[in-house]
């Protein structure tokens, strides 16, 4: 997150981190039920760990943290690397969470976000993609949903209904390491960090997010059948 601020502790209890090895954070994730996470499909790895209820970037133990293994990763069937369409993936964890003030699921928005909606994006990603600086704690940033026209003008030929743009204030953006993390609008999960230009936070090159309202049925059906 570029030019965000430290999240209040436990204010994003649905925020998850996907880790390679003991502590290599490579993507964010979102808790949507006691045993299921959403993340970006491009975050798929054969083996990874899941950390919930953690505030710090460092591996230091925190009392609210809960660690899990992913036992099933189900990318959306319409996702195809290196494209960005349908960039979401369900992860089933090896057990259910212990519900606490630090770890709680978020409800997915059924209605699509409209232009001007204020949302919160969060993550432990780099705070400057040109220098790869990382925050000490989870970062939060208020962003604004942009019109479809403005989104398409920013990225001609690359935007479809499975995406929306948000941000566009120069110097404020999600960034590398934030992928798969939540965009929450009016208390509901509206999107996942997906892609954008490099480096992050450039004028007229907003962050692009997976448009979850288009996938509510697939998410529910997939969870029910697994």
């Amino acid at each position: 997150i570029v030019n965000g601020s430290d999240c209040q502790k436990d204010a994003q209890p649905w925020q998850g981190a996907l880790l390679l090895g003991p502590n290599k954070l490579y993507c964010g994730a979102v808790l949507i039920s006691p045993q299921w996470l959403l993340t970006a499909a491009h975050c798929r790895k054969p083996v990874f760990r899941i950390r919930l209820g953690h505030h710090s970037m460092s591996p230091v133990y925190e009392s609210g943290q809960q660690m899990f293994q992913g036992i099933k990763s189900i990318p959306h069937p319409g996702y195809s690397h290196p494209g960005h369409s349908n960039d979401l993936m369900l992860i089933k964890m090896n057990r259910k969470i212990r519900d606490s003030h630090s770890v709680k699921p978020v409800e997915i928005a059924c209605d699509c976000a409209t232009e001007g909606t204020r949302c919160m994006v969060s993550g432990w990603g780099t705070t400057s993609s040109s220098h790869n600086n990382f925050p000490k704690v989870l970062q939060c940033l208020n962003i604004t949903v942009l019109s479809e026209e403005r989104c398409k003008n920013s990225y001609p030929g690359q935007i479809d209904k499975t995406m929306f743009c948000a941000g566009d204030e120069e110097g404020r953006d999600s960034c590398q390491g934030d992928s798969g993390g939540p965009v929450v609008c009016n208390g509901k999960l509206q999107g996942l960090v997906s892609w954008g230009d490099f480096p992050c936070a450039q004028r007229n090159r907003p962050g692009v997010y997976t448009n979850l309202c288009e996938f509510v049925k697939w998410i529910k059906d997939t969870m029910n059948s697994n």
Epitope: G21, K24, Y26, S58, P82, H84, F134, Q176, S179, G207
Partner: antibody, heavy 127, light 107 residues
Framework: QVQLVQSGAEVKKPGSSVKVSCKAS????????ISWVRQAPGQGLEWMGG????????VYAQKFQGRVTITADESTSTAYMELSSLRSEDTAVYYC????????????????????WGQGTTVTVSS | DIQMTQSPSSVSASVGDRVTITCRAS??????LAWYQQKPGKAPKLLIY???SLQSGVPSRFSGSGSGTDFTLTISSLQPEDFATYYC?????????FGGGTKVEIK
């Protein structure tokens, strides 16, 4: 301009250990990966392992597992590579190198290549 | 571990020649490939990252291409300072293995 400055040449006996340092001058380690690469005389490059100084997480090539330890001190922007149970075939030039760690257009966090290298440290293992 | 196979192991060429070096990964690595140049007694120098992105300060006669398992480094018009050994490295997963190297020699 960041430079990686390594410690001086070492001559070691078989069975002993060597610890090579790598200090970043004019910059920081934060948000980078520091890798160690060695090159035996007349041979190619061999990746030994790397460390994410921000988390202290180190990863090693299987070949060196149990024999190499990579550490980093963020406060002094110095990384260390210690290789134990030395044998003659460990005679090589040892390089540290810095890699930017990021995704590209997607916003996952991953690697680029190693854009800044140390000058190399010659380690000779001989009885 | 992912094996990286470079070919040819050496190539003789003249100034002005177009030189192509290939690198094959034993499994798909998307675009997570870097190319380095090394001169005798010197540390390697990064030329290309993410398979095709030119590192800052590297002459545009160097270019990289490929994705998945097959990659190419091309020097469009060889210059005297380009005679060196070139290595590919996959940075997709650990250990970050190198190819065996290609020595570009003067014909």
């Amino acid at each position: 301009q960041v430079q990686l400055v390594q410690s001086g040449a070492e001559v070691k006996k078989p069975g002993s250990s060597v610890k090579v340092s790598c200090k970043a001058s004019g910059g920081t380690f934060s948000g980078y990966v520091i890798s160690w690469v060695r090159q035996a005389p007349g041979q190619g490059l061999e990746w030994m392992g790397g460390i994410f100084p921000i988390s202290g997480y180190a990863v090693y090539a299987q070949k060196f597992q149990g024999r190499v330890t990579i550490t980093a001190d963020e406060s002094t922007s110095t990384a260390y590579m210690e290789l134990s149970s030395l044998r003659s075939e460990d005679t090589a030039v040892y390089y540290c190198a810095r890699a930017s760690a990021s995704g590209y257009y997607d916003r996952s966090y991953y690697y680029y290549g190693m854009d800044v290298w140390g000058q190399g440290t010659t380690v000779t293992v001989s009885s | 571990d992912i094996q990286m196979t470079q070919s040819p192991s050496s190539v003789s060429a003249s100034v002005g020649d177009r030189v192509t070096i290939t690198c094959r990964a034993s499994q798909g690595i998307s675009s997570w490939l870097a190319w380095y140049q090394q001169k005798p007694g010197k540390a390697p120098k990064l030329l290309i990252y993410a398979a095709s992105s030119l590192q800052s300060g590297v002459p545009s006669r160097f270019s990289g291409s490929g994705s998945g398992t097959d990659f190419t480094l091309t020097i469009s018009s060889l210059q005297p300072e380009d005679f060196a050994t070139y290595y590919c490295q996959q940075v997709s997963s650990f250990p970050q293995t190198f190819g065996g190297g290609t020595k570009v020699e003067i014909k």
